[in-house]
């Protein structure tokens, strides 16, 4: 394989490394209150936390990035914590013809990794 | 659509926003000199730069993240610049039976977005 094994234990202490966290947001927060009717409030799972060397590396590229960041921190950024997968969410919204239910596949994170 | 249109012009000035940049790396830099034979040096395209509000948003989730970061910067991180696609690269490496050519699909970034 082109890469060392990604680490899954956080060397920075509990809750500091890349993980999924729930953020409460209203339609007003999202600027959606003019077209989304429901839900009024969303429990949004988001990816937060740091990406220390080789922690939850998304792929070979992320591992290279981590290594080069160690060598050239001013030139190469550290990997960062982003969604690895998403959970579909259904929104009820206004349409020209009335009200519609629509599924959005890329709205709520289900898992995170360092990319 | 669940989201505003992502921005493609950088409000921070030229070269400051999320973009593809070439980084030169040797096999020694990558720690691969013991098993990769060729190329001796790699031109690695990596994603660097900032992700200001709605710049090159990867998807709806990234746009929500940008918006909530504006409202709760301590709780929600800004989107960050990561690969949207990769370019395959062929490496020549040692194997138990000799030398092999192998394609790696996730080694060099081809495009970037804010996730």
């Amino acid at each position: 394989s082109a890469h060392a094994h990604p680490r899954d234990s956080c060397p920075l202490g509990p809750g500091r490394c890349c993980h999924l966290e729930t953020v409460q947001a209203t339609l007003e927060d999202l600027g959606w209150s003019d077209w989304v009717l429901s839900p009024r409030q969303l429990q949004l799972s988001m990816c937060v936390g740091e990406c220390p060397h080789l922690y939850r590396s998304a792929n070979t590229h992320a591992q290279i990035k981590a290594r080069l960041h160690g060598l050239q921190p001013d030139k190469v950024p550290a990997p960062c914590c982003v969604p690895s997968s998403y959970t579909p969410v259904v929104l009820m919204h206004r349409t020209d013809s009335g009200v519609s239910l629509q599924t959005y596949d890329d709205l709520v994170a289900r898992g995170c990794h360092c990319a | 659509s669940a989201h505003a249109h992502p921005r493609d012009s950088c409000p921070l000035g030229p070269g400051r926003c999320c973009h593809l940049e070439t980084v030169q790396a040797t096999l020694e830099d990558l720690g691969w000199s013991d098993w990769v034979l060729s190329p001796r040096q790699l031109q690695l395209s990596m994603c660097v730069g900032e992700c200001p509000h709605l710049y090159r948003s990867a998807n709806t989730h990234a746009q929500i993240k940008a918006r909530l970061h504006g409202l709760q910067p301590d709780k929600v991180p800004a989107p960050c610049c990561v690969p949207s696609s990769y370019t395959p690269v062929v490496l020549m490496h040692r194997t138990d039976s000799g030398v092999s050519l192998q394609t790696y699909d996730d080694l060099v970034a081809r495009g970037c977005h804010c996730a």
Epitope: L37, S38, P39, R40, Q41, L42, Q43, L44, S45, T87, P88, V89, V90, M92, R94, V99, S100, L101, Q102, T103, V108 | -
Partner: antibody, heavy 121, light 107 residues
Framework: QVQLVQSGAEVKKPGASVKVSCKAS????????ISWVRQAPGQGLEWMGW????????FYAQKLQGRVTMTTDTSTSTAYMELRSLRSDDTAVYYC??????????????WGQGTLVTVSS | DIQMTQSPSSVSASVGDRVTITCRAS??????LAWYQQKPGKAPKLLIY???SLQSGVPSRFSGSGSGTDFTLTISSLQPEDFATYYC?????????FGGGTKVEIK
């Protein structure tokens, strides 16, 4: 605890109208929608439509369009369903149901006890 | 409109039996499916939502599975209070539609 209490049974003549009420308690009324479902004797469940208790936007089932009106009174946390031009095949038990909606989707998590509407000449 | 087809329409079973009810959607509905139990003269009661999430207060012998077009409600060990009619419901798109129901009867 969440409760939905509906108005009592009604007997109506064909061509008349009926208005069924559904009083909610135990939660913030405007946070969730209300759906109406009916069940003819010995039959299955038929969804009639939905109303947002927050915006009063509605969606009505096609077959009832033009005959049904759903409304809410947020001051009393009450939802209403009016059905006009009643026919004998409108004879059914009418239920209101809180329509919970979050990132796990929609579901009817609390129901009223039902209101029997009999249409007979 | 999305049609929901339940099978069987009725099933005879004994206390302690494992009972499986299936529900098929006429088009893909992701995991946007709920299951309800109804006893004679009573309002329906929510058992399962989002295809497999157990509603609070519902016994763990009830479970749901499936996604897309094919779904299953399983009662792992039938209890006397489980004899009732069960309905599936799609909440993927308007109009919301119910299956025709499955009556679980005492053998």
């Amino acid at each position: 605890q969440v409760q939905l209490v509906q108005s009592g049974a009604e007997v109506k003549k064909p061509g008349a109208s009926v208005k069924v009420s559904c009083k909610a308690s135990g939660y913030t009324f405007t946070n969730e929608g209300i759906s109406w479902v009916r069940q003819a004797p010995g039959q299955g469940l038929e969804w009639m439509g939905w109303i947002s208790a927050y915006t009063a936007d509605t969606f009505y089932a096609q077959k009832l369009q033009g005959r049904v009106t759903m409304t809410t009174d947020t001051s009393t946390s009450t939802a209403y369903m009016e059905l006009r031009s009643l026919r004998s095949d409108d004879t059914a038990v009418y239920y209101c149901a809180r329509t919970r909606h979050d990132t796990s989707g929609l579901r009817f998590d609390y129901w009223g006890q039902g209101t029997l509407v009999t249409v007979s000449s | 409109d999305i049609q929901m087809t339940q099978s069987p329409s009725s099933v005879s079973a004994s206390v302690g039996d494992r009972v499986t009810i299936t529900c098929r959607a006429s088009q893909g509905i992701d995991s946007w499916l709920a299951w309800y139990q109804q006893k004679p003269g009573k309002a329906p009661k929510l058992l399962i939502y989002a295809a497999s999430s157990l509603q609070s207060g519902v016994p763990s012998r009830f479970s749901g599975s499936g996604s897309g077009t094919d779904f299953t409600l399983t009662i792992s060990s039938l209890q006397p209070e489980d004899f009732a009619t069960y309905y599936c419901q799609q909440v993927h798109s308007f109009p919301i539609t119910f299956g025709g129901g499955t009556k679980v009867e005492i053998k």
